[in-house]
Amino acid sequence: MMTGTIETTGNISAKKGGSVILQCHLSSTMAQVTQVNWEQHDHSLLAIRNAELGWHIYPAFKDRVAPGPGLGLTLQSLTMNDTGEYFCTYHTYPDGTYRGRIFLEVLESSGGGGAGGGGHHHHHHHHHH
């Protein structure tokens, strides 16, 4: 039975040109995390963090995605096109797959909102394949 829950940074906002940290945390389970996949709204994989093999940042994002902190991901040099949903997919054993969702809104530099700032409401979601 899957008992775990994913906590995420929920709905966040950051300024154009700035950076933001995408963070998920799996709790309430003893399952072993074997891999975390970071995905974008359009089916693009941003990065994979394999528990043993380390990070693989996808070629299209290498110049502006940094691994970490922890199992999280840092997006840099934000553009308006980065606005949208991001997903962390936790592959675990023996539970299976958990998935969390983050919504990022990129704001014009002149507007309000701080990098990695706005609206840290935690979002809980678990999903199994």
């Epitope: 891999q35 089916h43 994989l45 394999n50 043993e52 093999l53 380390g54 693989h56 996808y58 070629p59």
Partner: antibody
Framework: QVQLQESGPGLVKPSETLSLTCAVY?????????WHWIRQPPGKGLEWIGY???????NYNPSLKSRVTISVDTSKNQFSLKLSSVTAADTAVYYC??????????????WGQGTLVTVSS | EIVMTQSPATLSVSPGERATLSCKAS??????VAWYQQKPGQAPRLLIY???YRYTGIPARFSGSGSGTEFTLTISSLQSEDFAVYYC?????????FGGGTKVEIK
């Protein structure tokens, strides 16, 4: 230039243990990457068996996990595969390969030439 | 386990023509797919990683596309050395799996 070369007996009896070695030239296996075994039954597709990471940790295909051991001999710069309790279904060409996970994800960029192992009495 | 299904099993193409090979995943693998070429008696050779990126030294006539569950390897103008078996592989999950292969033969 990185090169990998498999070696070991070409014939193994049923119920015995298959043992293969992969010698790595041009790179120290303790310096990085993960080192894999893949097999290919005659006329069929490829099946990933497992790997040993340069740190020494291992990971195996769940379908073979109970029979597989992959280990490293750092003094000889080689890694080995042991597959126990073999049957005719284990007859295959066995390949060793390197995975540069940071650059290419789960794709394997260097392969040995392969060695055919036949399980027969 | 994620199952990768390749089609067709055999593709007959004339030299100079275009070849289009298909690979379907049993579940969404985003863009975590690689393609390999294998000639008789040889080891597989990495062509494409991350669904669409050519590996070092691979000619531009090889291109990969797709995301989610459907992927394509295209060889724009087949050369004599391209007749071989091609395999796709997924690495979205922690258990890597390969397709059954497509044999590209001379028509």
């Amino acid at each position: 230039q990185v090169q990998l070369q498999e070696s070991g007996p070409g014939l193994v009896k049923p119920s015995e243990t298959l043992s293969l070695t992969c010698a790595v030239y041009g790179y120290s296996i303790t310096s990085g990457y993960s080192w894999h075994w893949i097999r290919q039954p005659p006329g069929k597709g490829l099946e990933w068996i497992g790997y040993v990471h340069y740190s020494g940790s291992t990971n195996y295909n769940p379908s073979l996990k109970s029979r597989v051991t992959i280990s490293v001999d750092t003094s000889k710069n080689q890694f080995s595969l042991k597959l126990s309790s073999v049957t005719a279904a284990d007859t295959a060409v066995y390949y060793c390969a390197r995975m540069d996970y940071g650059n290419y994800g789960g794709a394997m960029d260097y392969w040995g030439q392969g060695t055919l192992v036949t399980v027969s009495s | 386990e994620i199952v990768m299904t390749q089609s067709p099993a055999t593709l007959s193409v004339s030299p100079g023509e275009r070849a289009t090979l298909s690979c379907k995943a049993s579940q969404d693998v985003r863009t975590a797919v690689a393609w390999y070429q294998q000639k008789p008696g040889q080891a597989p050779r990495l062509l494409i990683y991350s669904a669409s990126y050519r590996y070092t030294g691979i000619p531009a006539r090889f291109s990969g596309s797709g995301s989610g569950t459907e992927f394509t390897l295209t060889i724009s103008s087949l050369q004599s050395e391209d007749f071989a078996v091609y395999y796709c592989q997924q690495y979205y999950s922690t258990q890597w799996t390969f397709g059954g292969g497509t044999k590209v033969e001379i028509k």
